[in-house]
């Protein structure tokens, strides 16, 4: 059947459409276009015999059609008179006639839409505001947006005029929005620009910053006022119900007690013509004296002296309040307080118990601090340490020692050679020692202020020789995949290079392998059973050489899965059952049989003489060793066969 | 897209032929007439008629028919016009034009250029 | 045979500017008027029909107006790619004829 397809339908103002034709009959004479929805020879468009290649214009011919061979016709610059039906008339090579009819509508194109409102600045809870969309436009569907988004569900919003005005009712300040609204058409859309909606509103109760009431006499009074307000409210300050100053801020310096009283702010909106008051009752306290802080021992020893700390003035009614380190005070059976907390016992203080110490009197305001107070604890002198560690010298160099001991007040230092006083210096220098110069090196640390005296003695000896080295070890007996082992060369010697042996060779390259300590120390990580072997330290400088004794690391392992022997799982009735467990470790381990499920004897073979087919079952070997708390086991399946009922059984042990 | 593309340049001798083609591409051939416009040096363009490129039956003007003719290979897509007993007045660039079915013309070859020289 | 009168034959404009070219027919031609513009070594190039519809992809600083026998072709804000003789044509009857061509220089 002979169609007509508009394209597009609905065509804008300027543009073009093609009406297309489908299913145009084969053999044709010509055919005619008309404007309308049938044949009139007064609105002809166009007529084309296909014969002639020659079109012929009719009256209804505006010069802004083609027609194409295959009957299709083109309407250009399109005019709004232009909508409407189009009927094409074919007559086929036979004069039989055909005719079909189509349509299309036309729009303008539609310009950008603007936004009046009757009401530039509502009031909010009292005006409405109606928005119209402008120009009014046939055939064009309105459309509102606000802040960019679709028209909200509200009963205070209101469309009418076919969309075309937007009315808000009872205007908020929520209601100051971007508003916008668009005109569409089937062939164009258009937004307006945004209008903002400037809603007057409040004052609010206005409230005043900050919010605490209490000062101290001295301070000074800075409050500010707002109130939530379009356009923004003027304030005004009043004091005891008397005006001060028309400032959004009220700034008094240097309050007294006599500031105390009411405070008003009073917000004004000039175009609501609103006003609304806020009070604040201000109060001024008279200034406490600052804390301090005695105490009745100035001087403590540690572990033998208690401390009472007092903070001074008495005050009565009052809070006191105690801080260490800047820290609230930590719970300890130590420290003690007294009833009114005024006074801080420390009990047998040590030199940790420092501070500082601050307390704190605590007003209707604020707390007020004392100065920090510390503690001079006296301790000591500890256990002296001398320094250098080594103890064996080369003759012609010198040999510089020197003491230390913690200790308050800093402990005096005396030194002694084989009990004999040398000198009282923190560090003994001689020079170009000889072997005679070997012996029992003596520090003693005296504190003149506790009377306490420490020693620390130390053995140095000169020689030229090296002497033999020994090994000492961390651990004598490390267990296998998880202990580590550090090995270390004694003694420690100037100038000396240090070396190791393990079974007679030099050090394998191994990741579980490390070297420290200027060599002195060998650390094995995470050691395992092969590292059970004979180890040698070495030492030398330029004119000797020595090694060490081997020792033999002691490596616990195991136990590892058991085997049971022999291996037959197959017997003949009336032979012996012996089964032999073996499994690694080290020490060796603990042996415990099962017999389906029911223990057995604590031996490493089990033997049953004359098994009978009762004896079938699970047989488990269970090991433990009680140095590395591993546990292991195996099970074993046996069958007993009645004699001779199958070949090749096993007679037995 | 429609195209139109003539061939190349010639130079005769009086009392020659010459056969200049108009290849046709980008619609359906027959549907459409095909016109031919002559151009001589320094003049302006002269409309010498047409070929009804459905039925073959060409149309000339009065200034042009005797030794001028129109002609088509249909299947080539191709009008030709050929001059028979060339005269120094036929030098001129030839022009072949497709004509709209209301008659006209809305695209162009580039020309061919016909020199006549003894 | 219609006969065309076209004028001016040639003439000079400045860039920006505006020219007009008048075609009169010895008949009324009722609108088949078409207007070309054709440049050396190329084909002419259709840019109006029927008097003054612009054909597509031809920029608006072209347009056409007139009927009966007076027709008019205009060009405003010149340009330089303008620079083409420009040819009136009438395609009322079956025998068509050109104007005589006007040369335009900028």
């Known amino acids: 059947k002979l169609t007509i397809e508009s394209t597009p339908f609905n065509v804008a103002e300027g543009k073009e459409v093609l009406l297309l034709v489908h299913n145009l009959p084969q053999h044709l004479f010509g055919y005619s276009w008309y404007k309308g929805e049938r044949v009139d020879g007064n609105r002809q468009i166009i007529g084309y015999v296909i014969g002639t290649q020659q079109a012929t214009p009719g009256p209804a011919y505006s010069g802004r059609e083609i027609i194409y061979p295959n009957a299709s016709l083109l309407i250009q610059n399109i005019i709004q008179n232009d909508t409407g039906f189009y009927t094409l008339h074919v007559i086929k090579s036979d004069l039989v006639n055909e005719e079909a009819t189509g349509q299309f509508r036309v729009y303008p194109e539609l310009p950008k839409p603007s936004i009046s409102s009757n009401n530039s600045k509502p009031v909010e809870d009292k005006d409405a505001v109606a928005f119209t969309c402008e120009p009014e436009t046939q055939d064009a569907t309105y459309l509102w947006w606000v802040n960019n988004q679709s028209l909200p569900v509200s009963p205070r919003l209101q469309l009418s005029n076919g969309n075309r005005t937007l009315t808000l009712f009872n205007v908020t300040r929520n209601d100051t929005a971007s508003y916008k609204c668009e005109t569409q058409n089937p062939v164009s859309a258009r937004r307006s620009d945004s209008v903002i909606l400037n809603v007057l509103y409040g004052p609010d109760a206005p409230t005043i910053s900050p919010l605490n009431t209490s000062y101290r006499s001295g301070e000074n009074l800075n409050l500010s006022c707002h109130a939530a307000s379009n356009p923004p409210a003027q304030y005004s300050w009043f004091v005891n119900g008397t005006f001060q100053q028309s400032t959004q801020e009220l700034f008094i310096p240097n309050i007294t007690v006599n500031n105390s009283g009411s405070y008003t702010c009073q917000a004004h909106n000039s175009d609501t013509g609103l006003n609304r008051t806020t009070v604040t009752t201000i109060t001024v306290y008279a200034e406490p004296p600052k804390p301090f802080i005695t105490s009745n021992n100035s001087n403590p020893v540690e572990d033998e002296d208690a401390v009472a700390l007092t903070c001074e003035p008495e005050i009565q009614n009052t809070t006191y309040l105690w801080w260490v380190n800047n820290q609230s005070l930590p719970v300890s059976p130590r420290l003690q307080l007294s009833n009114d907390n005024r006074t801080l016992t420390l009990l047998s203080v040590t030199r940790n118990d420092v501070g500082p110490y601050e307390c704190g009197i605590q007003n209707e305001l604020s707390v007020d601090h004392s100065d920090p107070v510390i503690l001079n604890v006296l301790y000591g002198p500890d256990d002296p340490t001398i320094s250098p560690s080594y103890t064996y010298y080369r003759p012609g160099v010198n040999l510089s020692l020197s003491c230390h001991a913690a200790s308050n007040p800093p402990a005096q230092y005396s030194w002694l050679i084989d009990g004999n006083i040398q000198q009282h210096t923190q560090e003994l220098f001689i020079s170009n020692i000889t072997e005679k110069n070997s012996g029992l090196y003596t520090c003693q640390a005296n504190n003149s202020a506790s009377g306490h005296s420490r020693t620390t003695v130390k053995t140095i000896t000169v020689s030229a020789e090296l002497p033999k080295p020994s090994i000492s070890s961390n651990n004598s007996k490390p267990v296998e995949d998880k202990d580590a082992v550090a090995f270390t060369c004694e003694p420690e010697a100037q100038n000396t290079t240090y070396l190791w042996w393990v079974n007679g060779q030099s050090l394998p390259v191994s990741p579980r392998l490390q070297l420290s300590n200027g060599n002195r120390t060998l650390t094995l990580f995470n050691v395992t059973r092969n590292d059970a072997r004979a180890y040698v330290c070495g030492i030398q400088n330029s004119v000797s050489a020595n090694r060490s004794d081997p020792v033999t690391l002691d490596v616990l392992y195991g136990p590892d899965t058991p085997i049971i022997s022999p291996p037959d799982s197959s017997y003949l009735s009336g032979a012996n059952l012996n089964l032999s467990c073996h499994s690694a470790s080290n020490p060796s381990p603990q042996y415990s049989w099962r017999i389906n499920g029911i223990p057995q004897q604590h031996t490493q073979v089990l033997f049953i003489a004359k098994i009978t087919p009762n004896n079938n079952g699970t047989y488990a070997c269970f090991v433990s060793n009680l140095a590395t708390g591993r546990n292991n086991s195996i099970v074993k399946s046996i069958t007993v066969s009645a004699s001779g009922t199958s070949p090749g059984l096993s007679a037995g042990a | 897209q429609i195209q139109l593309v003539q061939s190349g340049p010639e130079l005769k001798k009086p009392g020659e032929t010459v056969k200049i083609s108009c290849k046709a591409s980008g619609y359906t051939f027959t549907t459409y007439g095909m016109t031919w416009v002559k151009q001589a040096p320094g003049k302006g363009l002269k409309w010498m008629g047409w070929i009804n490129t459905y039925s073959g039956v060409p149309t000339y003007i009065d200034d042009f028919k005797g030794r001028f003719a129109f002609s088509l290979e249909t299947s080539a897509s191709t009008a030709y016009l050929q001059i028979n007993n060339l005269k120094n007045e036929d030098t001129a660039t030839y022009f072949c034009?497709?004509?709209?079915?209301?008659?006209?013309?809305?695209?162009w070859g580039q020309g061919t250029s016909v020199t006549v020289s003894s | 045979d219609i006969q065309m009168t076209q004028s001016p034959s040639s003439l000079s404009a400045s860039l920006g500017g505006k020219v007009t070219i008048t075609c009169k027919t010895s008949q009324d031609i009722n609108k088949f008027m078409a207007w070309y513009q054709h440049k050396p070594g190329k084909g002419p190039r259709l840019l109006i029909r029927?008097?003054?519809t612009l054909q597509p992809g031809i920029p608006s600083r072209f347009s056409g107006s007139g009927s009966g026998r007076d027709y008019s072709f205009s060009i405003r804000n010149l340009e330089p790619e303008d620079i083409a003789t420009y040819y009136c044509l009438q395609y009322d009857d079956l025998t068509w004829t050109f104007g005589g061509g006007t040369k335009l220089e900028i």
């Open positions: 034009g497709r004509k709209d079915l209301l008659g006209f013309m809305d695209y």
């Open positions: 029927y008097t003054s």
